[in-house]
């Protein structure tokens, strides 16, 4: 007679989880040196002990610090990207202008970029079936909490100016119930930042509204603010062109505004 | 370094344990491997234990053996040897680099 | 569990000649795979890891290649010190599911 298993509203862990996150670490390793002396064994093992035989829904920080100790990663402070709801052209960005780092730029980011994953209460077995949804069912879950924890430290990392690409073509440009608006606004150390700086990414060619007047980055600079770190706002009206200028700043196009 | 202890003669049922006592490294960090060698024959491994603790064993080793470690000490237990057990047993250390650090190795007979 | 297939078991080459090992593994272990040297009662000696670095203190003449399933060592130059078992393996990784650590059957290297 089957086990009766839990229904979670979510899609379930990513098929093959523990061999996608085993070759990412070894391929990580390989590609940053100064994380040559991390055993991915461990960092497995690591991971997997923090989801593994525990209810989806009861999940704790607790629970990574061993994978967090192993993943510890010194990223320069100064050069770090956040991100909110514009993942990809975050990405783009770092891949090209090198010495800047988004989370997912580090090993533990890495690790789980678009993966999901979770375990059963009291049984060895990865739920590949359904995973509780962050709405629906429970925010304690294995992916959000995981997300929490690594984006708590890698905002209290930060130091000097640091950035944050925001996403024009949404409703709420700054929402409050975003990682960043959530976890990583209220992570930022004011002994340590001096300025948060805004990069608000235009979807449209022929938008030329200054976004930084909208609401919501009225409401992110208030917070900023009350924090006594700085705040400032660029809009980037051609994120192709931005991009293309990151590449070829010499470029005489490039010194127009973009 | 890594030094093996424990290897003795044994009748063949007698369960035997092996220990590898380690001095300067972090076994939180570090996963560590039992291999062992057969008189004129390859390498093998028996199984690991990762810095988290947890084992895995070659499929043909599950059963047989049994890794567990402490803060300093890393031990193979051999539960039920039999002839073919006989060999010497390496500790090493397995990084991403490669297993890097072997212990000289203790040698098992089992004999009855 | 992966299987490390390692050719030839044997082969003869006079000094200052050349020598290639072949080594393949069952599935792709990118570049974690590792060359030793193991002379008579003595434990194995790492010679390459990560598929072609040279270990601290290895003579440049032993050169490692490949990557995915199928890797290469290669002797030039040979001397009679190079006489001696060559073993490849790899240290991929185990999950529940897999164990990634293995070591081919060995090469014998017969120097003339």
């Known amino acids: 007679v089957p086990r009766w298993r839990q229904q979670w509203s979510g899609p379930g862990t990513t098929k093959r989880f523990p061999e996608t996150v085993l070759a990412r670490c070894v391929k990580y390793t390989e590609i940053h040196p100064e994380m040559r002396h991390v055993d991915c064994q461990s960092v497995w093992d690591a991971f997997k002990g923090a989801f593994i035989s525990k209810h989806p829904c009861n999940i704790t920080e607790e629970d990574y610090q061993p994978l967090m100790k192993l993943g510890t990663q010194t990223v320069p402070c100064n050069k770090i990207l956040l991100w909110s709801r514009i993942k990809d052209l975050a990405h783009q960005f770092t891949q090209v202008q090198r010495d800047m780092f988004t989370l997912e730029d580090t090993l533990l980011g890495y690790l789980a970029d678009d993966l999901t994953w979770c375990g059963e209460f009291n049984t060895s077995k990865i739920n590949y079936q359904s995973c509780p949804d962050w709405r629906k069912d429970c925010s304690n879950n294995p992916v959000s909490v995981f997300w929490k924890t690594v984006s708590r430290r890698f905002a209290e990392a930060a130091c000097d100016v640091v950035h944050v690409m925001l996403n024009g073509s949404r409703s709420k440009i700054f929402d409050k119930n975003s990682t960043f608006g959530s976890v990583e606004v209220h992570n930022l150390q004011p002994e340590k930042v001096q300025t948060l700086e805004a990069w608000v990414i235009h979807g449209g060619r022929e938008d030329s509204r200054d976004l930084c007047q909208d609401p919501t980055i009225k409401e992110l600079e208030s917070i900023i603010s009350k924090r006594n770190i700085q705040f400032s706002c660029k809009n980037i009206y051609r994120p192709d062109k931005f991009l293309q200028c990151v590449k070829n700043p010499e470029d005489s196009s490039c010194t127009s505004e973009i | 370094s890594l030094e093996e202890s424990g290897g003795r003669l044994v009748t063949p049922g007698t369960p035997l344990t092996l220990t590898c006592t380690v001095s300067g490294i972090d076994l939180s960090i570090y996963t560590m491997a039992w291999v062992r060698q057969a008189p004129g024959k390859g390498l093998e491994y028996i199984g690991i234990?990762?810095?988290?603790?947890t084992t895995y064993y070659a499929t043909w080793a599950k059963g047989r053996f049994i890794v567990s470690k402490t803060s300093t000490t890393v031990d193979l237990k051999i539960t039920s040897p039999t002839t073919e057990d006989t060999a010497t047993y390496f500790c090493?250390?397995?990084?991403?680099?490669?297993?890097?650090?072997w212990g000289p190795g203790t040698l098992v007979t089992v004999s009855s | 569990d992966i299987v490390m297939t390692q050719t030839p078991a044997s082969v003869e080459a006079a000094v200052g000649g050349t020598v290639t090992i072949n080594c393949q593994a069952s599935?792709?272990?990118?570049?974690?795979l590792a060359w030793y040297q193991q002379k008579p009662g003595q434990r194995p000696k790492l010679l390459i890891y990560k598929a072609s670095t040279l270990a601290s203190g290895v003579s440049s003449r032993f050169k490692g290649s490949g990557s995915g399933t199928e890797f290469t060592l290669t002797i030039s130059d040979l001397a009679s010190a190079d006489a001696a078992t060559y073993y490849c393996q790899s240290y991929y990784g185990a999950t529940s599911s897999s164990f990634g650590y293995g070591f081919g059957g060995g090469t014998e290297v017969v120097v003339k």
């Open positions: 090493v250390r397995t990084t991403v680099q490669s297993t890097d650090l």
């Open positions: 599935q792709n272990i990118y570049s974690n």
């Open positions: 234990i990762s810095g988290y603790g």
